[in-house]
Amino acid sequence: TLNSVLNSNAIKNLPPPLGGAAGHPGSAVSAAPGILYPGGNKYQTIDNYQPYPCAEDEECGTDEYCASPTRGGDAGVQICLACRKRRKRCMRHAMCCPGNYCKNGICVSSDQNHFRGEIEETITESFGNDHSTLDGYSRRTTLSSKMYHTKGQEGSVCLRSSDCASGLCCARHFWSKICKPVLKEGQVCTKHRRKGSHGLEIFQRCYCGEGLSCRIQKDHHQASNSSRLHTCQRH
């Protein structure tokens, strides 16, 4: 379904009161940092493309961000605009296309060779009581529900994937590392270009679950190289 294709753990989308996208179908997916996109107009064809009004980036498609169509334009009139490619100027992560993020005012690639997505180095560090102060929602897991005997739940800090409970992996989120869900069939995944290289994505996705591999979605073969959508598919 469209929902399962769109749903990803790169970063989570906001509840309707915050995200302002209650009427949109689908979930969020983002390889672009800082951004979440419920629905948006990504799946409209060019022929029936209409400027999509928005209040914030979450309301736009994966390859879009929310801004005034004219430079220095009225902030009250904002639409979803096409994301900016590598080396283009940016003012926030949302403006950069998937696989890039905004650093020092320029969209830069999220790929850096020195980082491996699933860091399995042997760090001999014991976990003590570690209580984060983020709270406020009825269903929550904080960064820090780690104890000696428990495996980290979603949102718990981690050093390696073995620190996380079953079905979770240890991945980067912003500048920290937390347990995130392993991807299920149909979910968007990140295909890294070189074997053994995991991108330094500011919002890093987990790998595909058992029996699944990250492959180009069949109906996206015709798309341009940069915009091919990879999803977790059965071997």
């Epitope: 970063i11 989570k12 989308n13 906001l14 509840p15 009161p17 915050l18 995200g19 800082g34 951004i35 979440l36 928005c54 209040a55 914030e56 980036d57 979450e58 961000y65 902030a75 904002q78 940016c90 003012m91 926030r92 992560h93 949302a94 403006m95 993020y101 905004c102 005012g105 850096q112 980082f115 860091i119 760090i123 560090e125 976990f127 003590g128 570690d130 209580h131 984060s132 102060t133 983020l134 406020g136 929602y137 009825s138 269903r139 929550r140 897991t141 960064l143 820090s144 780690k146 949102g155 800090v157 981690c158 050093l159 980067r172 912003f174 500048w175 920290s176 590392k177 937390i178 330094l200």
Partner: antibody
Framework: QVQLVESGGGVVQPGRSLRLSCAAS????????MHWVRQAPGKGLEWVAV????????YYADSVKGRFTISRDNSKNTLYLQMNSLRAEDTAVYYC??????????????????WGQGTTVTVSS | EIVLTQSPGTLSVSPGERATLSCRAS???????LAWYQQKPGQAPRLLIY???GRATGIPDRFSGSGSGTDFILTISRLEPEDFAVYYC????????FGGGTKVEIK
């Protein structure tokens, strides 16, 4: 308990250097992004720099880029800020802060959830 | 960079009254990454609200946050003596920026 303690502040002449430290305890330091934030006397908060959990990536405010260096030693649970070519406008209380991420239902949220008490840097001739 | 403008600069309110603090961004900000902090004289800032509306641990329910896009609000429903302080909003877009702060003082 979760605690951050800054040290290394003091009075220094313009153009000179200073290194601040932030000792972390009570949490898994090596999994968290860490920040430096400063506050000039009588002014608001200004973000200075952030470093990735493993020290392999960092990011600076334009005002300090090329002069300040953020680093960390995860084996010592310590964050550092090396400040070179100091200017009068760098005079401030410097805080280290921990990046926090919460998961609520299907959503991730962000905030600087733990702060140190601050260390004062005065740049004066 | 994204500029956050807080208003008013100073808010004079009597204890027990409601206080409404505004934070306006120069461009759209993801609600996920909009936070509010409280700072008292001589103390470090304290996280109050994250994700525009989520209360941090130990924060009383008289504090609430709302808003999306470019306009965000921090509301203190009934001011207690200990609430008189400076309040900052903060975002993470491409860089981390704080608003200039709103001082809530006793009327």
């Amino acid at each position: 308990q979760v605690q951050l303690v800054e040290s290394g502040g003091g009075v220094v002449q313009p153009g000179r250097s200073l290194r601040l430290s932030c000792a972390a305890s009570g949490f898994t330091f090596s999994s968290y992004g860490m920040h430096w934030v400063r506050q000039a006397p009588g002014k608001g908060l200004e973000w200075v720099a952030v470093i990735l959990y493993d020290g392999s990536d960092n990011y600076y405010a334009d005002s300090v880029k090329g002069r300040f260096t953020i680093s960390r030693d995860n084996s010592k649970n310590t964050l550092y800020l090396q400040m070179n070519s100091l200017r009068a406008e760098d005079t401030a209380v410097y805080y280290c802060a921990r990046e926090g991420i919460a998961v609520a239902g299907d959503y991730y949220y962000y905030g600087m959830d733990v702060w140190g008490q601050g260390t004062t840097v005065t740049v004066s001739s | 960079e994204i500029v956050l403008t807080q208003s008013p600069g100073t808010l004079s309110v009597s204890p027990g009254e409601r206080a409404t603090l505004s934070c306006r961004a120069s461009q759209s900000v993801s609600s996920s990454y909009l936070a509010w902090y409280q700072q008292k004289p001589g103390q470090a800032p304290r996280l109050l609200i994250y994700g525009a509306s989520g209360r941090a641990t130990g924060i009383p329910d008289r504090f609430s946050g709302s808003g999306s896009g470019t306009d965000f609000i921090l509301t203190i429903s009934r001011l207690e003596p200990e609430d008189f302080a400076v309040y900052y909003c903060q975002q993470y877009g491409s860089s981390f920026t704080f608003g200039g702060g709103t001082k809530v003082e006793i009327k």
